[in-house]
Interface confidence: medium
């Protein structure tokens, strides 16, 4: 399994992982105590046939070509959690691992 | 976690799981001994803001709105394996569980 890494200067048009810092303060999400910002990353780019396909299923659907199947799209294929300190709905402070907050790899599925 | 299930008669335009039978014989994939066909399913439909979003990350990227982020797309969010009997590249018969061959649920990511 591998994926492309790009930045804002890249000329790569294919599915790629780009850096993105999420700033909770800028969003006005003041119930998040920490971190105030973190590196989330995101996926963008084109999914040509077979390029970076995570699952054999993606290839099979392309072969079968059913009505309305839009072809694969560039989406996270590996994600990781971050630890966060935040207020829950009952105003209790919670420290926990929040899954799938960081994109580690992008692919076509 | 939940996802919509549709069929070819559905009028649903949002992200949905549709039935699809993959026929290896029709593809000419004769290195696959069994099964000759199986129910794979596929995802199709629109991803309106927040509808069926699997990860908080998806929402955060939408909020941050970086250059080139295309918005979430309808993609498998839960997949399951099938057992297969097939020839590998060395012409040995292999019996194994192949991951991510069946779409169990679709969502926006």
């Amino acid at each position: 399994d591998f994926g492309l890494d790009c930045d804002e200067h890249s000329t790569e048009s294919r599915c790629c992982r780009y850096p993105l810092t999420v700033d909770f303060e800028a969003f006005g999400w003041d119930w998040i105590i920490a971190p105030k910002r973190y590196k989330a990353n995101y996926c963008s780019g084109e999914c040509e046939f077979v390029f970076l396909q995570k699952y054999p299923h993606t290839h099979l659907v392309h072969q079968a070509n059913p009505r309305g199947s839009a072809g694969p799209c560039c989406t996270p294929t590996k994600m990781s959690p971050i630890n966060m300190l935040y207020f829950n709905g009952k105003e209790q402070i919670i420290y926990g691992k929040i899954p799938a907050m960081v994109v580690d790899r992008c692919g076509c599925s | 976690d939940f996802g919509l299930d549709c069929d070819e008669h559905s009028t649903e335009s949002r992200c949905c799981r549709y039935p699809l039978t993959v026929d290896f014989e029709a593809f000419g994939w004769d290195w696959i001994i069994a099964p000759k066909r199986y129910k794979a399913n596929y995802c199709s439909g629109e991803c309106e803001f927040v509808f069926l979003q699997k990860y908080p990350h998806t929402h955060l990227v939408h909020q941050a709105n970086p250059r080139g982020s295309a918005g979430p797309c309808c993609t498998p969010t839960k997949m399951s394996p099938i057992n297969m009997l097939y020839f590998n590249g060395k012409e040995q018969i292999i019996y194994g569980k192949i991951p991510a061959m069946v779409v169990d649920r679709c969502g926006c990511s």
Partner: antibody, heavy 124, light 107 residues
Framework: QVQLVQSGAEVKKPGASVKVSCKAS????????MHWVRQAPGQGLEWIGN????????NYNQRFKARATLTTDTSTSTAYMELRSLRSDDTAVYYC?????????????????WGQGTLVTVSS | DIQMTQSPSSLSASVGDRVTITCKAS??????LSWFQQKPGKAPKTLIY???RLVDGVPSKFSGSGSGQDYTLTISSLQPEDFATYYC?????????FGQGTKLEIK
């Protein structure tokens, strides 16, 4: 429909060879194992071996391994069974049969279609 | 090789009778057993596979049972077209081996 059509009856002398053909139609020939079974007059069934036309991988009954060769011609969807150094006790009807998988385990199959049989008579 | 012992080797019965044929393997064959019907001058026809599953199109008067080493084919109500020779086959292990057959005749 799925069909297996075998070549006609043969009369051979002891020590000679015979090559029986089995032409498949109505399905993807390369995707199914073909088995060969024989039946001596008034006797039971005996398994000779099988072959996967996709790549020619074969298995033999040890009793026949030295004398039998299973081959296929994918361009004509035909399977062949050649038996060498014939003896009088090789006189039998030879059948081809398609192995059909209903599951995904290595033994999850049965014979769903048989050829009509080819009588091979070995006599001096 | 796995030996398949089929019994009886011949059986006389009347139309309407219920008959049972048995097959014993020399070792556990994990229910990988098929039953065949063969009429004179014809190729065998698979009736039952995996010990108890009926092939599509085969009448439900045929049934199979058993596990381990012991297996049974039952014909619930004999009809004239059922008089034939029946064979069992184990497909658990190479070489595949057949029972010696049971000839079912009209009494």
């Amino acid at each position: 429909q799925v069909q297996l059509v075998q070549s006609g009856a043969e009369v051979k002398k002891p020590g000679a060879s015979v090559k029986v053909s089995c032409k498949a139609s109505g399905y993807s020939f390369t995707g199914y194992f073909m088995h060969w079974v024989r039946q001596a007059p008034g006797q039971g069934l005996e398994w000779i071996g099988n072959i996967y036309p996709y790549n020619g991988v074969s298995n033999y009954n040890q009793r026949f391994k030295a004398r039998a060769t299973l081959t296929t011609d994918t361009s004509t969807s035909t399977a062949y069974m050649e038996l060498r150094s014939l003896r009088s006790d090789d006189t039998a009807v030879y059948y081809c049969a398609r192995r059909y998988y209903y599951g995904t385990g290595p033994a999850d199959w049965y014979y769903d279609v048989w050829g009509q049989g080819t009588l091979v008579t070995v006599s001096s | 090789d796995i030996q398949m012992t089929q019994s009886p080797s011949s059986l006389s019965a009347s139309v309407g009778d219920r008959v049972t044929i048995t097959c014993k393997a020399s070792q556990d064959i994990n229910s990988y057993l098929s039953w065949f019907q063969q009429k004179p001058g014809k190729a065998p026809k698979t009736l039952i596979y995996r010990a108890n599953r009926l092939v599509d199109g085969v009448p439900s008067k045929f049934s199979g049972s058993g596990s381990g080493q012991d297996y049974t084919l039952t014909i619930s109500s004999l009809q004239p077209e059922d008089f034939a020779t029946y064979y069992c086959l184990q497909s658990d292990e190479f070489p595949l081996t057949f029972g010696q057959g049971t000839k079912l005749e009209i009494k």
